[in-house]
């Protein structure tokens, strides 16, 4: 029986050009975490395997850093990074748990300020 629950950072926002840490935490179970996948919609970002370490998807290698812990750091954010992110925990013996995070990437306050007071 699956008794665990995934706690996530929920809905978060960050500035364009900045970075953000995506974090999930599995609680209320003694199941062993064997692998955590990080996905954006249907696109794989990274995998952390207990035995093999981290696999970062080649197309994200420049912008994704492993950790802290089982989390994932997204760098050089763009507005296209806005959307849903999923942490998928493979555990033994429970099976799979999934958590969801919604990230909104905002135009930076400096950019907004510059746009507001632009001289024609």
């Amino acid at each position: 029986m699956m008794t665990g629950t995934i706690e996530t950072t929920g809905n978060i926002s960050a500035e364009k050009g900045g970075s953000i840490i995506l974090q999930c935490h599995l609680s209320s179970t003694t199941a062993q975490v064997t692998q955590v996948n990080w996905e954006q919609q249907d696109q794989l970002l990274a995998i952390c395997n207990a035995d093999l370490g981290w696999h970062i998807s080649p197309s994200f290698k420049d912008r994704v850093a492993p950790g802290p812990g089982l989390g994932l750091t997204l760098q050089s954010l763009t507005v296209n990074d806005t959307g849903e992110y999923f942490c998928i925990y493979h555990t033994y013996p429970d099976g799979t748990y999934t958590g969801r995070i919604f990230l909104e990437v905002l135009e930076s306050s400096v950019a907004e300020h510059g746009a507001r007071f632009q001289i024609p």
């Epitope: 064997t34 395997n49 207990a50 035995d51 093999l52 080649p58 290698k61 033994y92």
Partner: antibody
Amino acid sequence: QVQLVQSGAEVKKPGASVKVSCKASGYAFSRYSMYWVRQAPGQGLEWIAFIDPYNGGSTYNQRFRGKATLTVDTSISTAYMELSRLRSDDTAVYYCARGGDYGWYLGVWGQGTLVTVSS
Amino acid sequence: DIQMTQSPSSLSASVGDRVTITCRASQNIYTYLSWYQQKPGKAPKLLIYNAKSLPSGVPSRFSGSGSGTDFTLTISSLQPEDFATYYCQHHYGNPLTFGQGTKVEIK
């Protein structure tokens, strides 16, 4: 197109070392891990280790710790595997292979390098 | 270690036949399984990854299925160039291990 070209066949004496090279072209070398697999004559495939050229980190099959050492030279897009303390049962074809986009599988393979250990 | 067991170890088939090869893992590997084809004197070639995904350039007559511990590679209509040895491999833990291979021969 993606290509991995390995160094030529080697004949070594027991106790010696050998260094096999794997030159990559047609893709961004640092974005993909490089794997090494061996195949003894008439036998199946055995994974040795892989290295991530992006940070130089290696992960080994415990069986090959102390036997194989992986390195890369990103400036020339080349991966290396050095095998030490060679024995006759190390005689095999050694393959390099580029890792996959979505995990720890082997997407593109080199042509193989035959290492023969004989006194 | 996760053991991978293929069956059969060899089979004889004719051009046009539907061929099925199975691979069993000693523990749950979800869908972290790949299949390779190897011809004599040549390097292996990736056919399937993540149990059912085909890399670009692999003919659609090849398909993969399964999850957990039981997996299948199917060749829907065997072609002359398909006579080879096929290996499965899990990519879920250290060490990565391969099945012992299935040799597909001409009947």
